[in-house]
């Protein structure tokens, strides 16, 4: 550690004195101190020597001596006052900066340690302290007031008493800024933006943040806009607004904007879209087919997508038909708005009934026009089926009528014993009928088929059926010749129950 | 041994503010005094300001109240703002530790134009 | 205009000795230290003199610096071409509370 000469911790000197300083230490040492005037330093080797032969109450401070080349940073201080009976106070700054709740230092050195006494701590023009302000005094350091608060920023002085009256330093300006938590806070609206050409238009940023130290600005496609700036503060935030005013927009004002705010913890930005078309415009779409086929019983949500500019002035969904006129119930109708020109509309037509299929239609309507977007529902049905025996063309014949949708298949069994349903180990013959004659095919309608099975003789211990199916289910009908005639049996259990 | 680095915009648009700091490396910011002086294309050496490791700071009276300067002892950086500012504020920005009434050692310096 | 005052450009050939001179005044020179700076170009300043005369390590004692009165002089021995750059006179100015420079002296290394 370096030692200073004179080895006291503070010198008191009168104006116009001679002061030497020396230091010396192992290696090189370096002096710092309060920058003042009047100093000479003169270095020699492991020793150096600051001094000044016109010493003045500005050269009151701490001057500290230290050893680059410690690994320990060791230093050594002299606390010098030049004790001027006209300046009780060197003060070391104008202004002060420090955060909230850090203690905040103004550098009044007093030069006259005998002062210390009447020593006391006001604001300009001798008004006094804002209550709750808690502060202590270093004669070396000066007034500190500890966990300064924002409201506490103000112009401060330091007094002395001096032959019994108090003697007022020069003021220190005291800033204490709010901690600023991150980048301000940002607003862009709208979030998204269609004009037609020759309307109006306004788009706003604005930012707010704890502390004023802030900049914002409104870009458009890269380029900084010249805005005036609205300033309030209000919740404790200070808030600055920047409001752009087109009266009539054309297609250079189209793209890209965005509101950037910074302060010294960082930038913030978001961006917003600005479209400007030539006329309104009514766009419906379904990420749907519009084809739709569901089973009987089971539930379906129509959905449309709209996108629209001006606004909506009116939509409705519309049952077309074509089994009756009922319409879809407004409650089963629903709207939901993605953003300002972006819609969706749903139809939920929950358990569907025979009666339900057809065609739906949304229609919306703006200044643009009419628009339909028309979905086809068509319902899923497991096939029935059911056999006759009968005589075409003087051939017995047996005529199995299947209907369901999509459309069956038929295939036939013969299997020995009576018995409702034909299994695997009485089955004596399997036919496919693959090309059924369609007798029905109306759209959203179940499709009707007829298979026939020519039989020359009817085997009395034996069994027919007739099985049908598609995509959601099977049905079949067995048919048990007995000597007084045929006899059809349906299964027990009737596999279709909606 | 002690090294200074400023950083910051190199374009500021007139009436905006400049806003540089200094990162010190090699020793703490701690018990020391430091400076920004600037110095415009061609031309002379200008001292701005400085502040303490406290938060005081003293500004060269030709910049009127423009200047505010800052200290983030954690991360061992120094800050100078200087508002409105104008074409004639154009130069090159130093960061240096000030010594009694000397300056060693200096940043390498970084030019700030103001153009809009 | 700098409240120091050098003249703008000075020159010498290698080997030469040139002396630059600093003029100022009872608030800076004539009560206060002289130090001055070497702007080598391109780069930045580089404390030369400090203290009137003193030299930082480092420094070749080719460089040496004196006062008198309210005027200050770096003279530069044995001239070299690596001399060629800006030099710079500072002093503490007693009403401004800080340093204050002078305008500069291009020396050129003929």
């Known amino acids: 550690i370096p030692v200073i000469e004179p080895s006291v911790p503070e010198l008191v000197v009168k104006p116009g004195a001679t002061v030497t300083l020396r230091c010396v230490g192992n290696g090189s040492v370096e002096w710092d101190g309060p920058p003042s005037p009047h100093w000479t330093l003169y270095s020699d080797g492991s020793s150096s020597i600051l001094s000044t032969n016109n010493a003045t109450f500005q050269n009151t401070g701490t001057y500290r001596c230290t050893e680059p080349g410690d690994p320990l940073g060791g230093s050594a201080a002299i606390h010098l006052y030049v004790k001027d009976p006209a300046r009780p106070w060197n003060v070391l700054a104008q202004e002060v900066v420090v955060f909230e709740d850090q203690d905040a230092l103004l550098p009044c050195l007093l030069t006259d340690p005998v002062l210390e006494a009447g020593v006391s701590l006001v604001r300009v023009r001798g008004r006094p302290l804002m209550r709750h302000t808690n502060y202590s005094f270093s004669p070396w350091h000066g007034f500190t007031i500890h966990r300064a608060k924002f409201i506490q920023s103000q112009d401060y002085q330091c007094s002395a008493l001096m032959g019994g009256r108090k003697v007022m330093s020069i003021s220190i300006r005291l800033k204490v800024q709010k901690v600023i938590p991150g980048p301000p806070a940002l607003t862009l609206v709208p979030a998204e933006l269609v004009r037609i050409r020759g309307e109006a238009a306004q788009i706003v940023c604005s930012a707010s943040s704890v502390d004023v130290n802030f900049d914002v600005f409104l870009q458009h496609n890269n380029t900084k806009l010249a805005i005036p700036q609205q300033s309030d503060f209000h919740n404790n935030r200070y808030q600055k607004v920047l409001t752009l005013n087109l009266d009539q927009v054309d297609f250079q004002h189209a793209g890209n904007y965005s509101c950037v705010a910074s302060n010294v913890q960082g930038k913030h930005s978001t961006s917003m879209f600005f479209r400007v078309v030539e006329s309104a415009y009514l766009n419906l779409s379904s990420e749907q087919n519009l084809i739709q086929e569901v089973t009987v019983g089971e539930g379906l949500n129509l959905k449309v997508m709209v996108e629209a500019y001006p606004g909506l002035q009116g939509f409705n969904w519309t049952y077309l038909g074509p089994f009756s006129d009922h319409q879809p119930e407004p409650k089963l109708a629903n709207a939901t708005t993605k953003d300002t020109y972006r819609h969706t509309f749903t139809l939920s037509l929950p358990r569907l009934k025979p009666s339900e299929a057809g065609r739906y239609s949304f229609l919306a309507r703006n200044p643009g026009g009419w628009r339909a977007l028309t979905f086809e529902l068509t319902l899923r049905y497991p096939p029935e089926v059911s056999v006759i025996w009968t005589f075409i063309n003087g051939s017995g014949t047996l005529l199995c009528a299947a209907s369901g949708y999509p459309q069956p298949n038929v295939t036939w069994l013969q299997c020995s014993g009576h018995t409702d349903r034909c299994d695997e180990a009485q089955v004596l013959q399997v036919w496919d009928d693959p090309y059924p004659e369609v007798l029905s095919q109306e759209p959203f309608h179940k499709v009707t088929v007829q298979s026939l099975l020519t039989v020359e003789t009817l085997e009395h211990n034996q069994t027919y059926e007739c099985r049908a199916h598609n995509s959601v289910g099977s049905g079949s009908w067995a048919f048990i010749p007995i000597s007084a005639g045929a006899h059809t049996h349906p299964p027990d259990e009737f596999l279709f129950t909606p | 041994q002690v090294q200074l680095q400023e950083s910051g915009p190199g374009l500021v648009k007139p009436s905006e503010t400049l806003s540089l700091t200094c990162t010190v490396s090699?020793?703490?910011?701690?018990?020391?005094?430091w400076s920004w002086i600037r110095q415009p294309a061609g031309k002379g050496l200008e001292w701005i300001g400085r502040i303490y490791t406290s938060g005081s700071t003293n500004n060269n009276p030709s910049l009127k109240s423009r200047v505010t300067m800052s200290v983030d002892t954690s991360k061992n950086q120094f800050s100078l703002k200087l508002s409105s500012v104008t074409a004639a504020d154009t130069a090159v920005y130093y960061c240096a530790r000030e010594r009694i009434n000397w300056f060693d050692p200096w940043g390498q310096g970084t030019l700030v134009t103001v153009s809009s | 205009q700098s409240v120091l005052t050098q003249p703008p450009s000075a020159s010498g050939t290698p080997g030469q000795r040139v002396t630059l001179s600093c003029s100022g005044s009872s608030s800076n020179i004539g009560s206060n230290t002289v130090n001055w700076y070497q702007q080598l170009p391109g780069t930045a300043p580089k404390l030369l003199i400090y203290s009137n005369n003193q030299r930082p390590s480092g420094v070749p004692d080719r460089f040496s610096g004196s006062k008198s009165g309210t005027s200050a002089s770096l003279a530069i021995s044995g001239l070299l071409s690596e001399d060629e750059a800006d030099y710079y006179c500072?002093?503490?100015?007693?009403?401004?509370?800080?340093?204050?420079f002078g305008g500069g002296t291009k020396l050129t290394v003929l």
């Open positions: 090699g020793d703490s910011i701690s018990n020391y005094y």
């Open positions: 500072a002093a503490w100015h007693d009403s401004l509370n800080g340093v204050v």
